[in-house]
């Protein structure tokens, strides 16, 4: 038999070998496809199946617009002018080339020694599903599950039967200062079909480096608060990826889950003390912020406070 590939929506003509080019012809076409359960013999007079597969005057079979359900086997049996029976057998596969793949949500830069999501490659409207591959500086990237991680997802459209592929690439660059170029390609896996490539993205890799500084911000400013007030401490750090932040009060670690923000609601005198935050970065040691002092003072002790009498001499309630 002969293997045929036809593009979805395009016509396909299968010739019936041995059939006389003009009537009278002795021939029979039968098909076994997604539209049939077993073999369907087509009527030479034509009929409802003509919209899918029609016998032409020369004995060939025309599929006016091939679809996924037309994949299957087509056979013709003809008697030639000399009375000899000639058989033709075709195995038909269909395909659809998707739109050009795209890298969506690309990273703006990468950080060495830590996992970085490069982006997600998306291909829409293929049949069969095909495959997505990532390339680094023009060379195929083989996922190893450690330095190079690829998360794939394939979805099929319930009506069209066409596939959407998504491939998310995560890498751990070994060193900074480089500018790797990533691209993604889609391949249907059919002979004589070149892969479709995305536009490449070039990313800067920077060393994780010690954070440029760690700051501890306090609200209210100055760290002076009335009893029952709220204090917010924020550990501001410029490192990527964000490090884990722990808190220290009067030299002792606070038993709290790591968080860049420490909230002290309804403060009392027991909350007074010196606070600092410690940022722990995967590739560098812990880094401690300069300390800040929190003081809880009764109204009037340290100048105006909530509900205090201001310069105007009038009582104001915030």
């Amino acid at each position: 038999g002969q293997n045929i590939t036809a593009r979805i929506g395009e016509p396909l003509v299968l010739s019936c070998k041995g059939a006389p080019k003009k009537p009278p012809q002795q021939l029979e076409w039968k098909l076994n496809t997604g539209r049939t359960e077993a073999w369907k013999v087509l009527s030479p007079q034509g009929g409802p199946w003509d919209s899918v597969a029609r016998i032409l005057p020369n004995g060939s079979l025309l599929l006016p617009a091939t679809g996924i359900v037309d994949e299957g086997t087509f056979r013709c049996r003809a008697t030639n002018r000399r009375g000899k029976e000639v058989k033709s057998n075709y195995r038909v596969r269909v395909y659809q080339i998707p739109g050009k793949p795209e890298i969506v949500d690309p990273a703006s830069e990468l950080t060495a020694s830590v996992p970085n999501k490069v982006g997600t490659c998306v291909s829409e409207g293929s049949y069969p599903a095909g495959t997505l591959s990532w390339h680094l500086d023009g060379k195929l990237l083989i996922p190893d599950g450690k330095e190079t991680l690829v998360k794939e997802e394939t979805r099929r459209h319930p009506e069209t039967g066409l596939f959407t592929l998504r491939s998310e690439l995560t890498v751990i660059p070994t060193q900074g200062g480089t500018h790797p170029t990533f691209s993604c390609s889609f391949s249907l896996g059919l002979p004589r079909r070149r892969p479709l490539n995305t536009a490449p993205i070039q990313l800067r890799v920077r060393e994780p480096g010690p954070p440029e500084g760690i700051q501890l911000l306090v609200e209210p400013e100055g760290g002076i608060v009335a009893p029952g007030g709220t204090v917010t401490l924020t550990c501001a750090i410029s490192a990527q990826p964000p490090p884990q932040v722990h808190w220290i009060k009067d030299g002792a670690p606070l038993p709290l889950a790591p968080s860049p923000v420490l909230l002290l609601p309804e403060v009392g005198h027991e909350d007074e003390g010196t606070y600092s935050c410690v940022a722990t970065h995967p590739s560098h040691g812990p880094q401690e912020s300069p300390p800040v002092s929190i003081r809880v003072t009764e109204t009037g002790d340290e100048g105006p406070a909530e509900g205090s009498v201001g310069e105007s001499g009038l009582g104001t309630l915030a």
């Epitope: 009527s43 009929g47 199946w49 003509d50 919209s51």
Partner: antibody
Framework: EVQLVESGGGLVQPGGSLRLSCAAS????????MTWVRQAPGKGLEWVAS????????YYPDSVKDRFTISRDNAKNSLYLQMNSLRAEDTAVYYC????????????WGQGTLVTVSS | DIQMTQSPSSLSASVGDRVTITCRAS??????VNWFQQKPGKAPRRLIY???NLADGVPSRFSGSRSGTDFTLTISSLQPEDFATYYC?????????FGGGTKVEIK
């Protein structure tokens, strides 16, 4: 909304001719086969004719072959049935329906037009 | 030509009854059978297409099944608006052939 509206029915003498029309709207007419089905008074449904989307291929049962001709004008979104050599047994309500092939099997029908063949 | 033998030709039933109508094809027609409902003075309305698929807007009490060349339309719980005539149609080969019809009447 798909709409099919038949016209052209009426009283005709045996041996006479009549041309039925069907105006289609609400779908891309030239993408679909079209079919005529009839129903004699108090009787069941009978297929009369089908035509493919291009109009190049037509199909008839033996009962009307060589007497009836189905045609279409895709530019006008119209379907026609030319009926010649009419007989008393052709008396029926004639329905126009979309489809008639294995891809689109008569999902939409017109309201019908009555043809009476009588002397 | 393919014959579609529909049975029964008529039946009487009450609201809430389960009703079954059968069509037998004289040869293999695959899945290419539809069911239609017709009320007096109205055009037929497609209920089931390709043997088992419910057409848009048709209540789920209607269902179609197939066993070889036998096709069945079932109304699980007959409603007042279901009293009508039902036809099967074979559209696998020309001539397209309808069953003779089944008139469902109020008992």
């Amino acid at each position: 909304e798909v709409q099919l509206v038949e016209s052209g029915g009426g009283l005709v003498q045996p041996g006479g001719s009549l041309r039925l029309s069907c105006a289609a709207s609400g779908f891309t007419f030239n993408n679909y086969w079209m079919t005529w089905v009839r129903q004699a008074p108090g009787k069941g449904l009978e297929w009369v004719a089908s035509i493919d989307n291009s109009g190049d291929n037509t199909y008839y049962p033996d009962s009307v072959k060589d007497r009836f001709t189905i045609s279409r004008d895709n530019a006008k979104n119209s379907l026609y049935l030319q009926m010649n050599s009419l007989r008393a047994e052709d008396t029926a309500v004639y329905y126009c329906a979309r489809g008639g092939d294995i891809l689109d099997s008569l999902p939409y029908w017109g309201q019908g037009t009555l043809v009476t063949v009588s002397s | 030509d393919i014959q579609m033998t529909q049975s029964p030709s008529s039946l009487s039933a009450s609201v809430g009854d389960r009703v079954t109508i059968t069509c037998r094809a004289s040869q293999d027609v695959g899945i290419y059978v539809n069911w239609f409902q017709q009320k007096p003075g109205k055009a037929p309305r497609r209920l089931i297409y390709r043997a088992t698929n419910l057409a848009d807007g048709v209540p789920s009490r209607f269902s179609g099944s197939r066993s070889g060349t036998d096709f069945t339309l079932t109304i699980s719980s007959l409603q007042p608006e279901d009293f009508a005539t039902y036809y099967c149609l074979e559209f696998d080969e020309h001539p397209l052939t309808f069953g003779g019809g089944t008139k469902v009447e109020i008992k």
